[in-house]
């Protein structure tokens, strides 16, 4: 059986939309499937790599690599999206290309970044972990770390940094899929909202779905002990 909830929820574009949340009900009137997984049920994607889930994550990453920061022209906010999802008239799509990007490193201004921009994250303004020396962030936003400390400045003069961010990574469903959403939408969908991250590639949704002890490598499920838990 299914339990359907419908509600008006604030979405990425800053408008309220009617959203459906469909929950598979437990046949035995017990905990939900997500709760059962958290409690240690024999759920194979938490025990070993699942090809379907792996392909889903790779597909999400490929899309994200090509994303940019969509900044609303009315200063109502910004969100990481694909160019096609960013209004040409009501917003500005900030995407580095050709030689418009910032330098890869302060010691070589000539080599420009082409991957980005990312809403609220920039290698020039991140103090921790700083992109410098032997630890220059790659020219691939899906390999960027989470920035834990920004340079102290109210305004940077960069469109993608001075806007009010409207969406962050949200882990939805038992498949460990990730979407950049508003907090409201994420909570309504019973997802896990990552306040600290800017990109889906920075979070490991399956690790969150599985719970219990974190994977040794967040990319590789290793909870073999589930076989004895349930």
């Amino acid at each position: 059986a299914q339990h359907v909830t419908t509600q008006l929820v604030l979405r990425n574009k800053g408008v309220y939309e009617s959203v459906k949340y469909i929950q598979q009900e437990n046949f035995w009137i017990g905990p939900s499937s997500i709760d059962l997984i958290h409690l240690g049920a024999k759920f194979s994607p938490c025990i070993r790599k699942d090809q379907q889930i792996e392909q889903l994550v790779l597909r999400e990453r490929d899309l994200e690599r090509d994303s940019g920061c969509c900044v609303q022209n009315d200063h109502s906010g910004c969100i990481q999206t694909q160019r096609k999802d960013c209004s040409e008239t009501l917003a500005t799509f900030v995407k580095w290309q050709d030689d418009t990007g910032p330098p890869m490193d302060k010691s070589d201004l000539g080599q420009k970044r082409t991957s980005g921009a990312v809403c609220h994250q920039d290698p020039r303004t991140c103090e921790e972990p700083a992109s410098s020396g032997a630890h220059i962030w790659p020219d691939d936003i899906t390999k960027w770390p989470i920035c834990t400390e920004q340079a102290k400045s109210n305004r940077t003069g960069f469109l993608h940094m001075d806007c009010q961010i409207k969406g962050r990574p949200c882990c939805i469903s038992t498949k460990g899929s990730c979407e950049i959403t508003t907090r409201e939408y994420c909570e309504f969908m019973h997802g896990y909202f990552h306040e600290e991250a800017t990109l889906c590639s920075q979070v490991h949704c399956l690790d969150k779905v599985c719970g219990l002890l974190p994977f040794l490598n967040p990319e590789v499920p290793d909870q073999f002990y589930r076989l004895w838990l349930s």
Epitope: K106, L109, G110, K112, A130, S132, G157
Partner: antibody, heavy 120, light 107 residues
């Protein structure tokens, strides 16, 4: 308030080493993205970027003068130093120290400049 | 090194008139172009960053435009305090380079 002040010998002879000091206040060279650079302007000519040093100790010297330039800092004293070895008459110029940022690569504050004459 | 060519070398203007100063780069520098003003016996002062971004404390009569290799600094209704030298600077690559300057003088 950010201030930078250059000091130097004023006059020196060819083949000598020019030693310049930039004393600054209102900010720290330990702050992320902060840098101090040296720019010179020979009389009636354009500005020339010489060298700079970053908050993390990384340095840059203009390749045209590279072998003659040495830049260093003393963060505890809020000072940056520039040495130009084996000077000659074309090194006669006004030398400025300038604050730069690795976020923008613009000079947001300049010193008043110090005049240096190389003459025998 | 990237060469910046400024024109004209000297511009004579009457207060109240508007002027345009040109800066041309020897190669494309995208939007990595900034403008400075230098008055006699004073240090240079940043006017415009990244082609057209305003700097706090700089009067709104100063504006910038252009991209790639051709850039313009415009002064709408020149005031007596605006006379002096104007330099452009590129930050596309090391070493940072400057134009030779345009001297704005009283006509």
């Amino acid at each position: 308030q950010v201030t930078l002040k250059e000091s130097g010998p004023g006059i020196l002879q060819p083949s000598q080493t020019l030693s310049l000091t930039c004393s600054f206040s209102g900010f720290s060279l330990t702050t992320f993205a902060m840098g101090i650079g040296w720019v010179r302007q020979p009389s009636g000519k354009g500005l020339e970027w010489l060298a700079h040093i970053w908050w993390d100790g990384e340095k840059y010297n203009n390749p045209v003068l590279k072998s003659r330039l040495t830049i260093s800092k003393d963060t505890s004293k809020n000072q940056v130093f520039l040495r130009i070895a084996n000077v000659d008459t074309p090194d006669t110029a006004t030398y400025y120290c300038a604050r730069i940022s690795s976020i923008y690569y613009i000079i947001d504050n300049w010193g008043q400049g110090t005049s240096v004459t190389v003459s025998s | 090194d990237i060469v910046l060519t400024q024109s004209p070398a000297t511009l004579s203007v009457t207060p109240g008139h508007s002027v345009s100063l040109s800066c041309r780069a020897s190669q494309s520098i995208s939007n990595n172009l900034h403008w400075y003003q230098k008055k006699s016996h004073e240090s240079p002062r940043l006017l415009i960053k990244y082609v057209s971004q305003s700097i706090s404390g700089i009067p709104s009569r100063f504006s910038g435009s252009g991209s790639g290799t051709d850039f313009t600094l415009s002064i709408n209704s020149v005031e007596t305090e605006d006379f002096g030298m104007y330099f452009c600077q590129q930050s596309y690559n090391w070493p940072l380079t400057f134009g030779a300057g345009t001297k704005l003088e009283l006509k």
